[in-house]
Interface confidence: medium
Amino acid sequence: AQNITARIGEPLVLKCKGAPKKPPQRLEWKLNTGRTEAWKVLSPQGGGPWDSVARVLPNGSLFLPAVGIQDEGIFRCQAMNRNGKETKSNYRVRVYQIPGKPEIVDSASELTAGVPNKVGTCVSEGSYPAGTLSWHLDGKPLVPNEKGVSVKEQTRRHPETGLFTLQSELMVTPARGGDPRPTFSCSFSPGLPRHRALRTAPIQPRVWEPVPLEEVQLVVEPEGGAVAPGGTVTLTCEVPAQPSPQIHWMKDGVPLPLPPSPVLILPEIGPQDQGTYSCVATHSSHGPQESRAVSISIIEPGEEGPTAGSVGGSGLGTLALA
């Protein structure tokens, strides 16, 4: 059989070899496709509901005005010429549809080195047959289950059109000390040969290297954080890292609207200053690193103060509810 590929929705003409160019003709077409239960016979006389799907042209060819998925199958023509010589034509028809350009959705802008990260999900819609999605790093194919690469794939079929939607989610574990701006792309390869791959626009997430920092120390004066009304409390955030990181302050987890500073002075303490304080050190190349939380409280004369560094308070909270 001769292999024929036809694009879904396009017309298709199949020649009946050996048939006289015009009537009278002795020929018949036999079809075994998704539209037929077994072999369906079509003659030049035609007529009936099949004419909208396939009909025999005056020259004996079979004409399909718009090929669909159900037209995949075997088409055979048997013709006899004026001298009584019989000729057979045999076609294997396969249909295809090229999807739209694949896209990467839910893409990460930043990855963390040394841990698994979701890079994004590649989506291709409207293909037939299904085809495949593959990922590339800096132009080279990524092999799933190798070097911290994993891919989760899903194929769905549209209940009415029969076309496929493919999804591929890429997870990678970037190596420490590797490329800080890797380039990822995804490509769709059609299920039928001779059609070129379609590639997404590339994405370039940053890779963040978490560097273990020495601990951030929060020093409270007076020790224990208990002070009489009107007294002063000094909080000092000590970070051994060089160059010195920026220091932000939190009260009850609420970011305090203050310029970055390693020292926070609470003069003339009142009830509104009571709460849980911590500092956050942010270095340009590291993530934020917070100190322990310490409790600041007011004691009336004769009261015992709480122990140093008791953790509690009411929340990384309400500033900048943008």
């Epitope: 930043e110 963390t112 920026q246 917070e290 990384l316």
Partner: nanobody, 117 residues
Framework: AVQLVESGGGLVQAGGSLRLSCEVS????????VGWFRQAPGKEREFAAA????????YYAASVKGRFTISRDNAKNTVYLQMNSLKPEDTAIYYC??????????WGQGTQVTVSS
């Protein structure tokens, strides 16, 4: 862009429990502190709980302390809010928010929690 998606809300009877999840995508998860906020009908949005970058520090509003527990799973890019002994006054839309350094820059769409008496 960083995206936050809350789930786990629903209808529960007073005294019951729910676990809310907040999945953070599009950024290095361990760079974000995450907070839960809630907004009851006709009221201002209020802070409920938060967890710091490392998970070492947790914070709670007085109204939920002892009943709610916040935790994070850095492998799953998810923060959880376990809510026990729920009361009708806990009925609200619960939002999660992510903080890079000093403000909550990114917000989810919210999940509805309804506690019936």
């Amino acid at each position: 862009a960083v995206q936050l998606v809350e789930s786990g809300g629903g209808l529960v009877q007073a005294g019951g429990s729910l676990r809310l999840s907040c999945e953070v995508s599009g950024g290095a998860f361990s760079r974000y502190a995450v907070g839960w906020f809630r907004q009851a009908p006709g009221k201002e949005r209020e802070f409920a709980a938060a967890i710091s970058w490392s998970g070492n520090n947790t914070y709670y509003a007085a109204s939920v302390k002892g009943r709610f527990t916040i935790s994070r799973d850095n492998a799953k890019n998810t923060v959880y809010l376990q809510m026990n002994s729920l009361k009708p006054e806990d009925t609200a839309i619960y939002y999660c928010a992510a903080m890079l350094v000093s403000t909550y820059d990114y917000w989810g769409q919210g999940t509805q929690v309804t506690v019936s008496s």
